[in-house]
């Protein structure tokens, strides 16, 4: 057969109108002409092309091809001639000040912040060579130089990740109901009930020893023990398996003896054996139909014509002559569009193709990173290149703790709290914000001073009942919180001075809340009877439900602003899922009763998702794209609840529309709230008033009663008819259609006044609930009965 790539020298053939005819008479899509790829394979599609000059930000390959400058010397050849990775190009490269050279034998530069971070980013590990000990005196330094609390050493778990914390340990004593394999010789510990059960569980088979079991051990003689029924096969390792499992290709015995000494697969006399060992009826051999999975029943039957010799079989790329007919195929990175023509595969359609940015090219794709991140050339994931090392901050009811994700050292940020569940941070100001459910207050402090009660500032302590979710808008300097007792969502300035209730209707059990100040949206979870995840503008307009099906107890939610996805954990379904910011492209990443036994908080950073689990009393992490690589970050935590990542890349800077306006605070008398950026015509912000006041006709000033002139001039999305309902004492209800910036009725006091004591619900263990139990039965009692607040755990 002729070379399938070159095509035949048969009669000339005209190409379709949207195709280009190569000199060798091949037809290629016209758009491939002058794209710097030799698609014709005789270079005729690249002849007579206008000369291309590379941009200043590009690298010019030796053959004139242009590639991004940052792809030069990155370990992958992007130039067709490989000149971007050549010795000549790369040895000239000097690493800039903020980068570290990987040594004289390498031309690779890595961010200086990756030096001594416990991960080998240079091929030879030069970035981790000669690093000083980082660990505190009470910590253990792992072989990979991460730090570990001393209590984790020799505890039977590989906490370091390289096994170094479990090397050279004295043999631990077996538990009270455990058996030591190999006598006292330091073997494994196995449950006592596994001893003398006719199955070898110890490597040395000591759990089935004759002297121990009072009978010949199943492996004591060369002959295996007889099985109970004739329909069973006796494994050499002692166990009995179904006789039908013998020689079935599956290893069912521990020692695989059910697949030993098996005859080679042969077909019956009236059958044909395919190349892969399967059998088909002999009459199907050479019947011009492919019956064997590998097509071998039709191999060697006909010596017919080679269609590939004529116009390459009509294939745009590769033509393969078959015994019957022919087949068009494509090179890597291309797919058949119409059985003959190859088109580029858009690998970027797969949202998980890259950890951040995916750029599709003809025949291949390339991953890139957002500013502030750099590609780790070993894992191909984007890693933070700027700023201090990221840390994970979490609450455990009585404390706020911090774990450095690079050094892995573990510290207490705020001790001696009463009942803290929700928290968030403001990275630029180094402040931490948290809610205490027992004291019914929202606090703030500088992180380095937060352990001192005198430095803890009370921001909100009025009309709070059960503030279970908290989020900081670091751009517009606001805090948002959910209150499951009052059934409200509120906003306040970060100093607590000005506040407003945004939502007080259609909330059942609001819990987690997250904000996207770059686009002007907030997101929250509600684990009430109609559990859902909702979204609205940061000013309370354009409320919409994103998830309402296959959702039961959504606890934590978090946003990945870069990939524009929302992640959440569901503690009833034991799932970790994600959706895009519009509620589409839903994915369940992990479904596990083990790792997601009772998840509560969730956070995302780089290529990982982190979550807390109340039942496991641990923090887990996994790959955020596929849910794989699940590992435990910390355990024995006693009620770990909310969790956030502290790193400057988690809170990118953006313009504050309220401060950019001609008038300070957007000209608003009270609150200036960012509006959702739905289109280029969206307003940048809207003004808001306290719960007892109304916006005036100028939409900026606040008045005690609606200004009569303004009732009909307002945006319909904001207009609401205020119903005549029973209100808190002293509140006026105005029966008129009037725009009060929020989508809600203004109210003076919270739905449950802070002076009212709420009866305590009994503490019910989740495991005792029947499937029909209402979500609301799942309470965990607040320790401070005087306050009368029940904190409910979805």
């Amino acid at each position: 057969a002729a070379d399938p790539l070159l095509g035949g020298q048969g009669p000339a053939k005209d190409c379709e109108k949207d195709q280009f005819q190569c000199r060798n008479e091949r037809c290629i899509p016209s758009v491939w002409r002058c794209d710097e790829d030799d698609d014709c394979l005789d270079h005729s599609d690249e002849d007579d092309c206008p000369k291309k000059t590379c941009a200043d930000s590009d690298f010019t390959c030796d053959n004139g091809h242009c590639i991004h400058e940052r792809w030069k010397c990155d370990g992958e050849e992007e130039c067709p001639d490989g000149s971007d990775e050549s010795e000549a190009t790369c040895t000239k490269q000097v690493c800039p000040a903020e980068k570290l050279s990987c040594g004289p034998t390498s031309h690779k530069c890595v961010p200086a912040s990756w030096r001594c971070d416990g991960e080998k980013d240079c091929e030879g590990g030069a970035d981790e060579a000669g690093c000083a000990t980082l660990c505190a005196p009470h910590e253990f330094q792992c072989g990979n130089r991460s730090c570990l609390a001393a209590v984790f050493v020799c505890d039977g778990d590989d906490d370091c990740g390289d096994g170094s914390d479990e090397r050279g340990c004295a043999d631990p004593a077996c538990g009270p109901r455990e058996f030591r394999c190999g006598g006292d010789g330091g073997g494994a510990c196995i449950p006592e009930r596994w001893v003398c059960d006719r199955q070898f569980d110890c490597e040395d088979r000591s759990d089935e020893a004759a002297e121990l079991c009072g009978r010949p051990g199943p492996g004591a003689t060369s002959a295996p023990a007889a099985c109970a029924t004739a329909s069973q096969f006796a494994c050499r390792s002692g166990e009995c398996v179904h006789l039908g499992w013998r020689c079935d290709g599956d290893r069912d015995c521990k020692d695989k003896s059910d697949e030993a000494d098996c005859p080679l697969g042969t077909c019956r006399g009236d059958e044909f054996q395919c190349g892969d060992g399967t059998c088909v009826l002999a009459i199907k051999h050479c019947n011009q139909e492919q019956d064997c999975p590998d097509g071998s029943d039709e191999a060697g039957c006909l010596q017919g014509l080679n269609e590939c010799l004529h116009n390459n079989g009509g294939c745009s790329h590769i033509c393969t002559d078959l015994k019957i007919g022919f087949e068009c195929t494509c090179p890597a990175g291309f797919q058949l569009l119409d059985q003959k023509t190859c088109g580029d595969i858009d690998e970027c359609k797969d949202p998980d193709a890259c950890s951040q940015i995916c750029v599709n090219y003809k025949g291949y794709f390339k991953c890139e990173c957002y500013p502030g991140y750099e590609m780790d050339l070993l894992t191909k994931n984007c890693k933070a290149a700027a700023g201090k090392s990221p840390s994970l901050i979490f609450t455990n009811r009585h404390e706020v703790r911090r774990i450095d994700l690079v050094k892995r050292n573990y510290s207490r940020l705020i001790p001696m709290l009463k009942n803290v569940v929700a928290l968030d941070v403001e990275v630029a100001t180094n402040r931490i914000y948290w809610c205490d459910l027992s004291y019914r207050k929202i606090y703030s402090a500088y992180m380095d001073k937060a352990s001192d009660p005198k430095e803890q500032e009370v921001l909100i302590d009025e009309q709070l009942h059960s503030p279970e979710g908290l989020a900081v808008d670091w751009v517009h300097k606001h805090i948002y919180w959910t209150d499951s007792g009052n059934k409200t969502i509120s906003v306040a300035t970060v100093d607590g001075g000005r506040r407003r209730t945004l939502f007080s209707r259609n909330l059942s059990e609001p819990r987690a809340i997250a904000v996207d100040p770059l686009r002007g949206f907030m997101y929250w979870s509600d684990w009430g009877d109609q559990a859902k995840i909702e979204k609205s503008g940061l000013n309370g307009v354009d409320r919409q439900t994103l998830v309402s099906d296959n959702i039961e107890w959504p606890n934590g939610i978090t946003l990945d602003l870069l990939s524009q996805r929302l992640y959440w954990v569901d503690s009833k379904l034991h799932q970790l899922s994600s959706i895009d910011f519009s509620g589409g492209n839903r994915k369940t990443l992990i479904s596990s009763t083990d790792f997601l036994s009772h998840p509560f908080g969730i956070a995302v950073f780089e290529d990982k998702v982190f979550w807390t689990d109340l039942e496991n009393e641990a923090i887990f992490s996994a790959n955020r794209l596929n849910g794989l690589e699940i590992s435990i970050l910390a355990e024995n935590l006693n009620n770990p609840h909310d969790i956030v990542i502290f790193h400057e890349l988690k809170q990118p800077r953006a313009p504050d529309a309220c401060e950019l306006s001609v008038q300070p605070n957007g000209g608003c008398e009270y609150l200036c709230l960012p509006a959702p950026q739905i289109s280029s015509h969206s307003p940048k912000y809207t003004c808001a008033c306290p719960d007892t006041m109304w916006l005036g006709p100028d939409m900026k000033r606040c008045y005690r009663a609606p200004q009569s002139t303004s009732t009909t001039t307002l945006a319909s999305t904001m207009t609401r008819t205020v119903p005549a309902t029973t209100r808190a004492p002293g509140t006026t209800v105005h029966r008129s259609t009037y725009q009060n910036h929020s989508t809600e009725t203004p109210s003076l006091t919270a739905a449950v006044p802070s002076s009212v004591s709420v009866p305590r619900a009994p503490s019910i263990s989740p495991s005792t609930l029947s499937p029909a139990t209402s979500n609301h039965s799942q309470h965990y009692a607040n320790e401070d009965s005087k306050m009368g607040s029940t904190v409910t755990a979805a």
Epitope: K441, V458, D461, E462, Q463, T493, D495, G496, G497, R498, Q663, P664, N665, E669, Y670, C689, P690, D691, T692, M693, R701, C702, A728, P729, G730, T731, L748, T749, S754, S755
Partner: antibody, heavy 118, light 108 residues
Framework: EVQLVESGGGLVQSGRSLKLSCAAS????????MAWVRQAPKKGLEWVAT????????FYPDSVKGRFTISRDNAKSSLYLQINSLKSEDTATYYC???????????WGRGVMVTVSS | DIQMTQSPPSLPASLGDKVTITCQAS??????IAWYQQKPGKAPRLLIR???TLESDTPSRFSGSGSGRDYSFSISNVESEDFASYYC??????????FGGGTKLELK
């Protein structure tokens, strides 16, 4: 109609203590921050204390911090100001004021005179 | 803390005059300034808030303006009941609350 009526003033010896009261009516007292503002004879106005709606937090300028204590009883719609270690410069008319939702003082009492003698 | 410097301390005027009082803050106060009138032996009365918003019972001859650090209060056509002391107040929802030193409007 909003009404604020102060009481408890008078002539007091330097170094002694005094407790002023303010009775509020005509509005839901428990929904508002309340404050005390004083005015020395022939002088300007000076803010001296503010208390939150529930009474859980209070604020003072540095000039009186440690000596003045503001408190409230929402059940009685009453506001109080305890002044300890009275000094001659505490001689002033003390006004009870309501802090409106937007932050300014929107209603005032008629004031009560405190004179500190040496 | 923010200081409010009010001037002049006293302002002689005749009936029908237009008078202006100024208040300068030690830093930008984002228009959060209120103006009060006080007559001898009486409590202060709120006239203007948020730089220029007149209270519902404030006559229209009173006005306010300003931004940043500099603010002014005017009476366009002085009437006999306007002779009193006037105070500016920088307010916010959190402390401190700072008054200007006051201006006494007197009959010339």
């Amino acid at each position: 109609e909003v009404q604020l009526v102060e009481s408890g003033g008078g002539l007091v010896q330097s170094g002694r203590s005094l407790k002023l009261s303010c009775a509020a009516s005509g509005f839901t007292f428990s929904n508002y921050y309340m404050a005390w503002v004083r005015q020395a004879p022939k002088k300007g106005l000076e803010w001296v204390a503010t208390i939150t709606t529930s009474g859980s937090r209070s604020f003072y300028p540095d000039s009186v911090k440690g000596r003045f204590t503001i408190s409230r009883d929402n059940a009685k719609s009453s506001l109080y100001l305890q002044i300890n270690s009275l000094k001659s410069e505490d001689t002033a008319t003390y006004y009870c004021a309501r802090r409106g939702p937007l932050g300014y003082f929107d209603h005032w009492g008629r004031g009560v005179m405190v004179t500190v003698s040496s | 803390d923010i200081q409010m410097t009010q001037s002049p301390p006293s302002l002689p005027a005749s009936l029908g005059d237009k008078v202006t009082i100024t208040c300068q803050a030690s830093q930008n106060i984002n228009k959060y300034i209120a103006w009060y009138q006080q007559k001898p032996g009486k409590a202060p009365r709120l006239l203007i808030r948020f730089t220029s918003t007149l209270e519902s019972d404030t006559p229209s001859r009173f006005s306010g303006s300003g931004s940043g650090r500099d603010y002014s209060f005017s009476i366009s056509n002085v009437e006999s009941e306007d002779f009193a002391s006037y105070y500016c107040l920088h307010y916010d929802n959190l402390p401190p609350w700072t008054f200007g030193g006051g201006t006494k409007l007197e009959l010339k």
